[in-house]
């Protein structure tokens, strides 16, 4: 699905007008607070589907989710869906009106929740009170959702300022049914360390007071004991945390680590593992295959990929000739290693608008103290075929030749076709094809020149033609692998006075 | 925000044909929408056609095969091409224009499709 524009946040004008368009190659529908607002269905030659929605006399009213989604999701492969944020400041509205509903909170289990108070403009502070409270409660604030948090049972209002006057919401009330089972969390520092460096792993659990802890883990079976140690978050009500840490972790320290917490008053129990790897040393690796020899075309975008695992952080470097690369001022290249888990990295060079001058051995580096890795590859810059030139000479010895000189990379292939009834050809008849048969009537000299500088192959290609008894049409077209150009030229006998 | 001027409208009989212009008093390169859309007597005002940035022309099913959107960047105008006109093809047409989140209405121009 593309959207336009894109958002995924807006911020539009009071009484205006805003268009948005949704488009997918199946047919696609807006969606407003789960219903379809009035909209146009639109088609494009290429099959593609649209649909348009615009929005007049914008009021703040109109401040909130919008969602782009296929109109019959089934069949599909996935049930995509395009979410764009409009906010329209609008000083005569202040908190947009909740349903009866959002208005009580009901948890069943300690949890975070939303107070879902929401105003028009994003540029609002906006603060949480309890109702009978003057005092701003510290709780983080999303323009789009509201408050989230972890809530006592009390009453709650949203204030803010829109110009000098003070604009209170509905109340909301939280309501705490009953405390639900244990609900245990086991994260660790690292998931892979080195021989020698340390293993910490918490294990959290929420919404009781008095919970035993009980740990599992390599070392353990061995019978060399780790004594937890257990505290509470004071921050957080109700949040006991036991710590289990191993100093100097040896490589038997590998292996499954499981917490399990009961509590006795409920006999509820939970339990969570998670998996510790502990290496010799640090490693880089390289995933998946990079070809030796990349394309891109000229004055196109080009991003290359390189994705490796590595602990710990590497250092990444990219070269080309041997020259180290950086983020350029001009944004003609760009350079990112993101990392897309605790040991995957995914870097990557962008190219804009390729020029030939790119075209080079580049090389990327990750190294940190253990371990390096490097990954070349030869960047090759497609030209598409140009024809520069095709002319037609007679020369004494009788016979006609055409000179046709045209420029791409990679080599383009030459291919000449002649059309003898004007009339009828080629929209009729099939033009034949020359220089590839038997015949003695036409000889054909071709050439080819790389020209360094310029990083293209030239080709120069001469067909002779024997005995030209009427008007011929002669084709010169060239190919590559990036696109195709054609001239033609009309051929007359030495005896016509005249040339078309 | 561009100032939007349309131009072409007329009386046309049915089955004739009429082009209508829409000239920016400014440049209209970076424009991510561009759009008519007309409003029959008594009836809301509705998309016929519209190109977005990078996009084909996309057209409703009424005016598919009749109607053709195009621009000129050069001359900051956008187009449209209305061939084999109904009588229902009869309204006022707007051009609309939208760049980030700042849009633009044309002032309209009277289309009769009538014998």
């Known amino acids: 699905l593309v959207v336009t524009p894109p958002g995924p946040e807006l911020v539009l004008n009071v009484s205006s007008t805003f268009v948005l368009t949704c488009s997918g190659s199946a047919p696609v529908v807006w969606e407003r607070m789960s219903q379809e607002p009035p909209q146009e269905m639109a088609k494009a030659q290429d099959g593609t589907f649209s649909s348009v929605l615009t929005l007049t006399n914008l009021t703040g009213l109109d401040t909130g989710e919008y969602f782009c989604t296929h109109n019959d999701s089934r069949g599909l492969e996935t049930d995509e869906r395009k979410r764009l944020y409009i906010f329209v400041p609008d000083p005569t509205v202040g908190f947009l009106p909740n349903d009866a509903e959002e208005l009580f909170i009901f948890l069943t289990e300690i949890t975070e929740i939303t107070i879902p108070c929401r105003v028009t403009d994003p540029q609002l502070v906006v603060t949480l009170h309890e109702k009978k409270g003057d005092v701003a409660l510290p709780v983080p604030y999303d323009h789009q959702r509201g408050f989230s948090g972890i809530f006592e049972d009390r009453s709650y209002i949203c204030k803010t300022t829109i110009g000098d006057r003070e604009v209170d919401s509905d109340a909301y009330y939280v309501y705490r049914l009953q405390v639900s089972s244990i609900n245990v969390s086991v994260n660790a520092v690292q998931t892979v360390v080195r021989q020698g460096e340390n293993i910490t792993l918490m294990c959290i659990v929420i919404g009781n007071e008095v919970v035993n802890f009980e740990w599992t883990y390599p070392r353990k079976e061995s019978g060399r004991l780790v004594e937890p140690v257990t505290d509470f978050l004071l921050d957080m009500p109700y949040h006991i945390r036991s710590i289990l840490h191993i100093p100097s972790a040896e490589l038997e320290d590998s292996g499954t680590y499981t917490c399990n917490v009961t509590e006795s008053v409920n006999d509820h129990q939970d339990e969570k593992a998670i998996n510790i790897t502990v290496v010799e040393s640090g490693y880089v690796r390289l995933l998946g295959e990079v070809g030796t020899l990349q394309f891109a075309e000229l004055h196109r975008s080009r991003t290359l990929q390189v994705v490796f695992e590595a602990y710990p952080p590497p250092t990444v470097l990219w070269f080309k000739d041997n020259r180290t690369l950086g983020d350029s001022s001009a944004g003609e290249i760009a350079l990112s290693t993101r990392n897309v888990s605790e040991t995957r990295y995914v870097s990557e060079l962008t190219l804009v608008r390729v020029k030939v001058a790119e075209a080079g051995h580049y090389t990327m580096r990750a190294f940190h103290e253990d371990a390096e890795v490097q990954l070349s590859f030869q960047l090759q810059i497609n030209v598409p075929v140009r024809v520069l030139e095709l002319s037609e000479s007679h020369p004494d010895s009788g016979e006609q030749t055409v000179r046709c000189r045209g420029r791409g990379m990679p080599q383009p292939n030459i291919i000449w076709s002649a059309c003898r009834d004007l009339k009828r050809c080629p929209r009729e008849l099939p033009p034949t094809l020359l220089g590839n048969s038997s015949e003695e009537e036409s000889q054909l000299e071709t050439n080819v020149t790389y020209w360094e500088e310029e990083q293209e192959f030239e080709v120069v290609s001469t067909l002779r033609l024997q005995h030209v008894d009427r008007p011929l049409s002669v084709r010169c077209t060239l190919r590559n692998a990036v696109g195709q150009d054609t001239q033609e030229v009309i051929v007359v006998p030495h005896s016509l006075p005249f040339k078309v | 925000e561009v100032q939007l001027v349309e131009s072409g409208g007329a009386l046309v009989q049915p089955g004739g044909s009429l082009r209508l212009s829409c000239a920016a008093s400014?440049?209209?390169?970076?424009?991510?929408?561009m759009g008519w859309y007309r409003q029959a007597p008594g009836k809301q005002r509705e998309v016929v056609t519209f190109?977005?940035?990078?996009?084909?022309?996309n057209y409703v099913d009424s005016v598919e095969g009749r109607f053709t959107i195009s621009r000129d960047n050069a001359k900051n105008t956008m187009y449209l091409q209305m061939n084999s006109l109904k009588p229902e093809d009869t309204a006022v047409y707007y051009c609309y224009m939208q760049s980030g989140t700042a849009g633009s209405w044309g002032q309209g121009t009277q289309v009769t499709v009538s014998s």
């Open positions: 400014g440049s209209i390169v970076s424009i991510d929408f």
């Open positions: 190109i977005t940035s990078g996009g084909s022309p």
